[in-house]
């Protein structure tokens, strides 16, 4: 008598998530009498996937009619495959008895599931950095299979080369995750720049997924300060202007100090944007020269985005020839930190 063979012809089968998987199994003989069962895995923890004799298995259907006389095909179809279905499936022949006795197992068919990567999520640094500094952006995508995947970084359409990518886990798994960290050197012109993480995978049919991050979230462009005096007015008032230019983000407060005492505090809001995404702001102060005996030291103190204050000072000459004050006189720049007072818009 020929020994019964349980034949699982495919060593492995690969299926896209959501599709159906067909697992083939035939037996070489109709005897001995007894049922066929399908298991995922072997050993004591194996899961019963389908019992052709009894049970309710809503996602599993036999390929051919198991009740048909002389049927030797015990292939099954599993619908709506998910990554959790991955594993090795065994077609097992039992000899009829009380209970049925396991007789022979097929060699097993490994089911792998092709699953699309999730949309890449790009996250930037927790704190802003200034131009010439390097910041890191991280891109993550999860749940894909098989493991082979390609990830590229771009800044404004130009491919980046300074990045490190890891795919986990290292060995075989149901699904995988990718994490990549790119290092980007900031420039003052990067307010409108964008970094893009692009992920290509066999399941995407050549249409890669992209995740983006705006460098505006990562960059701080500190302002330039210039203090100038406009011409003396007939009423002995001097108009001193503080020009704050090319800064980002908009969060900025400006304080005028007269001889070290706070004169006025203003806060930037609703400023028009420059082409490069930065902002400009001009604040002015009228100083009544006749009210002062000595020269007046005016300081324009700017605190930008929570950073230490930057000062520009300017001396208005009162004692000698006040009416001959020149216009647009260069101011002196100091790094002195004065106390900051939050004020309104200027």
């Amino acid at each position: 008598e020929e020994e019964l063979q349980v034949i699982q012809p495919e060593k492995s089968v690969s299926v896209a998530a959501g599709d159906s998987a067909t697992l083939n199994c035939t037996v070489s003989s109709l005897i001995p009498v007894g049922p066929i069962q399908w298991f995922r895995g072997a050993g004591p923890g194996r899961e019963l996937i389908y019992n052709l004799k009894e049970g309710h298995f809503p996602r599993v259907t036999p390929v051919s009619d198991p009740t048909k006389r002389n049927n030797m095909d015990f292939s099954i179809r599993i619908s709506n495959i998910t990554p959790a279905d991955a594993g090795t499936y065994y077609c097992v022949k039992f000899r009829k008895g009380s209970p049925d006795v396991e007789l022979k197992s097929g060699a097993g068919t490994e089911l792998s599931v092709r699953a699309k990567p999730s949309a890449p999520v790009v996250s930037g640094p927790a704190v802003r950095a200034t131009a010439e500094h390097t910041v890191s952006f991280t891109c993550e995508s999860h749940g894909f299979s098989p493991r082979d995947i390609t990830l590229k970084w771009f800044k404004n359409g130009n491919e980046l080369s300074d990045f490190q990518t890891n795919v986990d886990p290292a060995g075989k798994s149901v699904s995988y995750s990718i994490r990549s960290t790119a290092r980007v050197v900031l420039t003052r012109r990067d307010v409108h720049s964008q970094v893009i993480c692009e992920v290509a995978h066999v399941t995407l049919q050549g249409d890669p997924l992209r995740g983006t991050a705006n460098l505006s979230e990562a960059i701080r462009v500190p302002p330039f300060l210039e203090v100038t005096q406009q011409s003396m007015r007939a009423d002995n008032q001097v108009n001193v202007t503080c020009q704050v230019t090319k800064f980002y983000p908009q969060r900025l407060q400006l304080t005028w100090l007269e001889n070290g005492n706070v004169s006025r505090t203003e806060m930037a809001s609703a400023l028009p944007e420059n082409k490069d995404g930065t902002y400009n702001w001009t604040s002015w102060l009228l100083v009544n020269v006749s009210a002062h005996r000595d020269d007046v030291k005016l300081t324009c103190q700017v605190e930008h985005d929570g950073q230490p204050a930057v000062n520009k000072s300017f001396s208005v000459k009162v004692s000698a020839h006040p009416k001959e004050q020149g216009s647009n006189t260069a101011a002196e720049n100091t790094g002195t930190n004065e106390r900051n007072i939050y004020g309104g818009s200027g």
Partner: antibody, heavy 122, light 112 residues
Framework: QVQLQESGPGLVRPSETLSLTCTVS????????WSWIRQPPGKGLEWMGF???????FYNPSLKSRVTISLDMSMNQFSLKMTSVTAADTAVYYC????????????????WGQGTTVTVSS | DIVMTQSPLSLPVTPGEPASISCKSS???????????LDWYLQRPGQSPQLLIY???NRASGVPDRFSGSGSGTDFTLKISRVEAEDVGVFYC?????????FGGGTKVEIK
């Protein structure tokens, strides 16, 4: 190739809980059983239990009430927790991979960690 | 639980000579599919155990062919055709048919 690395405290106080983690590198957790085995000083091997990739656990009845084995597939790790330890639990603890290719039985514990010594003492 | 009994407890050997270790189980390890679920392990001094034989007679990957396993049912034997110095250590049999998995007490092989 696949490597296993046990980690956890080397000293545990009596009546406290022993916690060990085994990290699987270079291979998948899928299709294998993941076992904890211990060896008291100068003695033989004792199987404590294992977990399959589907989360099904099997424990040694002599320890069952005190032992929990869990699996973290995302981290490629599995863990052992044993409550109410005594000096008799002092041993080298091994994590190991068990193959299963056929039937209801198992086909060899083919990969072992290097073992971690746990001493139970106050 | 299935009880595993090994003999001898200690085995002094001469390099180049054969050696044999016996393992008996309290119930049959032969499953209805024809496989006998018995493993043999070697634990060298200061090392983790290493799988030598599974299913009673199948050599594990990388194991020298001087090791062979035989037997079925309840009586199993591990044979070393020519002992080498690196074979010293404790040999364990383990039943893998049902949980709890159980080990024999071990056989210590040492060079005479």
């Amino acid at each position: 190739q696949v490597q296993l690395q046990e980690s956890g405290p080397g000293l545990v106080r009596p009546s406290e809980t022993l916690s060990l983690t085994c990290t699987v590198s270079g291979g998948s957790i899928r299709n294998y059983y993941w076992s904890w085995i211990r060896q008291p000083p100068g003695k033989g091997l004792e199987w404590m239990g294992f977990i399959y990739d589907n989360g099904r656990t099997f424990y040694n009845p002599s320890l069952k009430s005190r032992v929990t084995i869990s699996l973290d597939m995302s981290m490629n790790q599995f863990s052992l927790k044993m409550t109410s330890v005594t000096a008799a639990d002092t041993a080298v603890y091994y994590c190991a991979r068990v193959r299963a290719y056929s039937g209801i039985g198992l086909d060899g514990t083919d990969v072992w960690g290097q073992g971690t010594t746990v001493t139970v003492s106050s | 639980d299935i009880v595993m009994t090994q003999s001898p407890l200690s085995l002094p050997v001469t390099p180049g000579e054969p050696a044999s270790i016996s393992c008996k189980s309290s119930q049959s390890l032969l499953y209805s599919n024809g496989y006998a679920y018995l493993d043999w392990y070697l634990q060298r001094p200061g090392q983790s155990p290493q799988l030598l034989i599974y299913q009673g007679s199948n050599r594990a990957s990388g194991v020298p062919d001087r090791f062979s396993g035989s037997g079925s049912g309840t009586d199993f034997t591990l044979k070393i055709s020519r002992v080498e110095a690196e074979d010293v250590g404790v040999f364990y049999c383990m039943q893998a048919l049902q949980t709890p998995l159980t080990f024999g007490g071990g056989t210590k092989v040492e060079i005479k």
